[in-house]
């Protein structure tokens, strides 16, 4: 279970109306359900129930995106339509280049994601919890343009930080 280094870039409107960027670093873990690969894309928040739909006509995004799923407490969904692994597979089928699960409220999901799968996904499946999950969800909940870059080694530290 290697550490996943996640850089999140938020594109927000500045007072002048143009875009300005804010970068946040956080860490998670690569699960055995997916590959230990780097990935980058725009964040798309997905509700766990939204992944239940098996509608072939549903929009398949035409670009690489990173799905972010906040898992609920198991008692709130005692008979889930899909396992956590099934949800990851469904997201990748829809075009996700990576999936990040917030497992803070469902820590049992970690074991489910790390059960040795004979057919692991070819894209990374990362889980985050605690303070890192809070940081991620605070950005995602803004519903602004945000991108995530997932790496399996720490990002190179720039000597200076610039804005637009």
């Amino acid at each position: 279970k290697e550490t996943a280094f996640v850089e999140v870039v938020l594109f927000e409107s500045s007072p002048s109306g143009d875009y300005t960027t804010y970068t946040t670093g956080l860490t998670g873990r690569f699960s055995r359900a997916g590959a230990t690969l780097s990935a980058e894309g725009e964040i798309v928040q997905m509700h766990p129930l939204g992944l239940c739909n098996n509608n072939d006509e549903e929009d398949l995004y035409e670009y690489g995106w990173v799905g972010v799923v906040k898992l609920e407490q198991p008692e709130l969904d005692p008979k889930p339509c899909l396992t956590v692994l099934g949800k990851a597979k469904r997201a990748v089928q829809r075009g996700a280049t990576a999936v990040i699960f917030d497992v803070s409220e469902n820590p049992e999901a970690i074991d489910q994601l790390n059960q040795g799968s004979e057919d692991p996904l070819k894209r990374p499946v990362v889980y985050v919890k605690g303070a890192d999950a809070i940081k991620l969800m605070n950005i995602v909940n803004k519903q602004k343009v945000a991108r995530a870059r997932i790496q399996h080694r720490p990002p190179r530290q720039p000597t200076e930080y610039f804005d637009m």
Epitope: T21, E42, Y61, K144, V145, F162
Partner: nanobody, 121 residues
Framework: QVQLQESGGGLVQAGGSLRLSCAAS????????MGWYRQAPGKERELVAG???????NYADSVKGRFTISRDNAKNTVYLQMNSLKPEDTAVYYC???????????????WGQGTQVTVSS
């Protein structure tokens, strides 16, 4: 490197409409946001509208409700539908691709050549 080709500018009467198009070619995997900026004579270049790959949009207050930005990711093209045009919309309109350099932690833009939009009263 990214190349941007704009089209659709021209002369139109106040209250009229125009549709600008911009096709991106080259390394477009980094086209995180595609947008339109404008520069009127003697003024600074300003953002008109932007759209992300996931179609999250951002508009300047002065064009909200009149202009609509859209994007075709498959064709790497961005459009700006401009309705109810006013003389103050007269400017050179530039297409831009906004990307992000993770190594330097700095965003950067690629620019088109610009297309003139003139709104007469």
């Amino acid at each position: 490197q990214v190349q941007l080709q704009e089209s659709g500018g021209g002369l139109v009467q106040a209250g009229g409409s125009l549709r600008l198009s911009c096709a991106a070619s080259g390394t477009i995997s980094y086209a995180h946001i595609m947008g339109w900026y404008r520069q009127a004579p003697g003024k600074e270049r300003e953002l008109v509208a932007g759209i992300s790959q996931g179609s999250i949009t951002n508009y300047a207050d002065s064009v909200k409700g009149r202009f609509t930005i859209s994007r075709d990711n498959a064709k790497n093209t961005v459009y700006l539908q401009m309705n109810s045009l006013k003389p103050e919309d007269t400017a050179v309109y530039y297409c831009a691709v906004i990307s992000y350099d993770y190594i330097k932690s700095v965003p950067f833009r690629y620019w088109g050549q610009g297309t003139q939009v003139t709104v007469s009263s």
